[in-house]
């Protein structure tokens, strides 16, 4: 007789879950020299720990302590860059500009970037079928718990200068929803960030507005004043020129605004 | 940076009891987990015990029914009541302070000893 098993609104687990998580803990352990220490079974073990026989829409921030302990990584304070619904420039940014740090540039969040995973109450099946979404069903699932978790606690290791990414062509530049706007704004420590920069990206090519004048850039700033964190603007009108410069600062054409 | 300030060690007979404390001063972030480490003589230093932000906690077996570690988050204080003191406790005891991308903070140590 088959199990009766709960059918949630949202993807089920990522195809060989486990694997991909062991097998990017390995590469990123690999690749970075001051993680060579790290026991990816360790960390796999931990991983399943915190969502494994539990009731995926009960995860609490302490499921993954054991994870996040076993991932901390010292990521140099100033060289952070925050980002919201524009994920994919930021990392080509960083994958050019080698000393700057997404989330995704750590080991932690390298581990569970594109991956969605659930299990089951009481048993140690992880769900391939369906995990809870986080508006049809439950805000307390394994994916949206382990985001909040390790954003908050990279937001808090920032310090200086911080940037953030946003994108321009979003009806909400700035989201109070997001990520970034829910969890990571928030976290920010005044004591040891002067400045939040905030980087609009545009996305068509004749588009020469000012984005830093839209009333959701002037809701984000007003919201870091009032945390005594100074606020600055800049718009990116080529987002492609804007990266081939960080690749070539010396190129005559990168002297003009992008 | 962060510096951690331990306080409480000294000589004590074997039964009785001691209090360490531990405080973190400087650049203060929400910190993570806060424990105690030992280190005795021509051995490694293990851990005695660790207190997650939420108040989760982990002793080693050695300590386990003797030793309570707490945690003032306000005060980003750590506490560690010793009871039942024996010889095998005699070491320097470390306070350290782990923030997951920020590393991990150790205190110069508290020397505690157990001895008639």
């Known amino acids: 007789v088959p199990r009766w098993r709960q059918q949630w609104s949202g993807p089920g687990t990522t195809k060989r879950f486990p694997e991909t998580v062991l097998a990017r803990c390995v590469k990123y352990t690999e690749i970075h020299p001051e993680m060579r220490h790290v026991d990816c079974q360790s960390v796999w073990d931990a991983f399943k720990g915190a969502f494994i026989s539990k009731h995926p829409c009960n995860i609490t921030e302490e499921d993954y302590q054991p994870l996040m302990k076993l991932g901390t990584q010292t990521v140099p304070c100033n060289k952070i860059l925050l980002w919201s619904r524009i994920k994919d420039l930021a990392h080509q940014f960083t994958q050019v500009q080698r000393d700057m740090f997404t989330l995704e540039d750590t080991l932690l969040g390298y581990l569970a970037d594109d991956l969605t995973w659930c299990g089951e109450f009481n048993t140690s099946k992880i769900n391939y079928q369906s995990c809870p979404d986080w508006r049809k069903d439950c805000s307390n699932n394994p994916v949206s718990v382990f985001w909040k978790t390790v954003s908050r606690r990279f937001a808090e290791a920032a310090c200086d200068v911080v940037h953030v990414m946003l994108n321009g062509s979003r009806s909400k530049i700035f989201d109070k929803n997001s990520t970034f706007g829910s969890v990571e704004v928030h976290n920010l420590q005044p004591e040891k960030v002067q400045t939040l920069e905030a980087w609009v990206i545009h996305g068509g090519r004749e588009d020469s507005r000012d984005l830093c004048q839209d009333p959701t850039i002037k809701e984000l700033e007003s919201i870091i004043s009032k945390r005594n964190i100074q606020f600055s603007c800049k718009n990116i009108y080529r987002p492609d020129k804007f990266l081939q410069c960080v690749k070539n600062p010396e190129d005559s054409s990168c002297t003009s605004e992008i | 940076q962060v510096q951690l300030q331990e306080s409480g060690g000294g000589l004590v007979q074997p039964g009785g009891s001691l209090r360490l404390s531990c405080g973190a001063t400087?650049?203060?972030?929400?910190?993570?987990?806060m424990g105690w480490y030992r280190q005795a003589p021509g051995k490694q230093r293990e851990l005695v015990a660790e207190i997650t932000r939420g108040g989760s906690t982990n002793y080693a077996d050695s300590v386990k029914g003797r030793f309570t570690i707490s945690r003032d988050n306000a005060k980003n204080t750590v506490y560690l009541q010793m009871n039942s003191l024996n010889p095998e406790d005699t070491a320097v005891y470390y306070c350290n302070a782990a923030h997951t991308f920020s590393g991990s903070f150790w205190g110069q140590g508290t020397q505690v000893t157990v001895s008639s």
């Open positions: 400087g650049i203060i972030f929400s910190i993570n987990d």
